[in-house]
């Protein structure tokens, strides 16, 4: 028969042959050959491959270095990497995330639109017209000003996006 | 500082019960396995088994099953080795200690001597 | 059960020597871990995945091997070298170590 040019999936071609891939949590020790299936070998401790493969040796898994501000969300197995995470209050770099970074404060005149995760950073947007922010925050919205009518107070200094309006008492020498 | 800090040492007669704590600092206990190996007096090291202390899953040299119980307390990032129906083979020095990652190549602790003996 | 038997059991060597040892497993492993260990002291990983130094480790040890032999090479012997080595396997439970080998001062 003709030799094949191409394999099935979770095949791979070598000396004119298809030989079963590696399944994940394991390497590949030796090519099928026409009388011998393909020889696999499971990945040991610390070790992982993720993918049908031809690898001849695992990776090794990713270590979650607390020095840059990283933890362990999932410990890896013979199937998959560790997956790290950011500490309390910081947020990966990258996709990857191989470090991490202190969650942005919103500034006076913006609030939080977003609180910031392990993967994603804070998203401030400013405080929209009847709306405040007068700290440095990494949780706090845009809170709206006081309605002084419904505390049958009157506005004596109006609001910005940076302050709360300041309510006063009603003049009483109106008719 | 990382440590594994293990209790101090225990003199049992024989078909008594020892427990062993393996106190962790410095990193999260659940984000290894905790490995107990024993080591007799000029001999070599033996592997009796290991917890994933975020499940409580072990996995425990045949040597030993039966005889040996592994623990862990996440809330206070300590774990346990317990071995039952002691005998004058298992005078040794038992160590605890962790898988490692490339960054961190395992940690051990300072190691527990138990004496059995009548 | 994989038994790992490690060949010599000690041996004597003088300080600049090549010193070999090796680590035989009964069926494909892996890898292999290198461990010393000085007297009444607990053992530190010394070579991981093989052929990996651990951190703090001269570039005078070296490690190499696949399937069923490993081996361990000083290349050049130093006084703080003298100890006992172990590999372990940590592919099959139950992991296994080889019976040690101690290295002494000729």
């Known amino acids: 028969p003709e030799p094949p040019t191409a394999c099935r999936e979770k095949q791979y071609l070598i000396n004119s042959q298809c030989c079963s891939l590696c399944q994940p949590g394991q390497k590949l020790v030796s090519d099928c050959t026409e009388f011998t299936e393909t020889e696999c070998l499971p990945c040991g401790e610390s070790e992982f491959l993720d993918t049908w493969n031809r690898e001849t040796h695992c990776h090794q898994h990713k270590y979650c270095d607390p020095n840059l501000g990283l933890r362990v969300q999932q410990k890896g197995t013979s199937e998959t990497d560790t997956i790290c995470t950011c500490e309390e209050g910081w947020h990966c770099t990258s996709e990857a995330c191989e470090s991490c970074v202190l969650h942005r404060s919103c500034s006076p005149g913006f609030g939080v639109k977003q609180i910031a995760t392990g993967v994603s950073d804070t998203i401030c947007e400013p405080c929209p017209v009847g709306f405040f922010s007068n700290v440095s925050s990494a949780f706090e919205k845009c809170h709206p000003w006081t309605s002084c009518e419904t505390k049958d107070l009157v506005v004596q200094q109006a609001g910005t996006n940076k302050t709360d309006v300041v309510c006063g008492p009603q003049d009483r020498l109106r008719a | 500082e990382v440590q594994l800090v293990q209790s101090g040492a225990e003199v049992k007669k024989p078909g008594a019960t020892v427990k062993i704590s393996c106190k962790v600092s410095g990193f999260n206990i659940k984000d290894y396995y905790i490995h107990w190996v024993k080591q007799r007096p000029g001999k070599g090291l033996e592997w009796m088994g290991r917890i994933d202390p975020e499940d409580g899953d072990t996995k425990y040299d045949p040597k030993f099953q039966g005889r040996v119980t592994m623990t862990a307390d996440t809330s206070t990032d300590t774990a346990y080795m317990e071995l039952s129906s002691l005998r004058s083979e298992d005078t040794a020095v038992y160590y605890c200690?962790?898988?490692?990652?490339?960054?961190?190549?395992?940690?051990w602790g300072q190691g527990t001597t138990v004496t059995v003996s009548s | 059960q994989i038994q790992m038997t490690q060949s010599p059991s000690s041996l004597s060597a003088s300080v600049g020597d090549r010193v070999t040892i090796t680590c035989s497993a009964t069926?494909?492993?892996?890898?292999i871990l290198w461990f010393q260990q000085k007297p009444g002291k607990a053992p530190k990983l010394w070579i991981y995945?093989?052929?990996n130094l651990a951190s703090g480790v001269p570039a005078r040890f070296s490690g190499s091997g696949s399937g069923t032999d490993f081996t361990l090479t000083i290349s050049s012997l130093q006084p703080e070298d003298f100890a006992t080595y172990y590999c372990?396997?940590?592919?099959?439970?139950?992991?296994?170590f080889g019976g040690g080998t101690k290295v002494e001062i000729k």
């Open positions: 372990q396997q940590r592919t099959f439970y139950p992991y296994t």
């Open positions: 069926s494909s492993v892996s890898y």
């Open positions: 995945s093989t052929s």
């Open positions: 200690t962790t898988s490692y990652y490339v960054g961190t190549y395992g940690y």
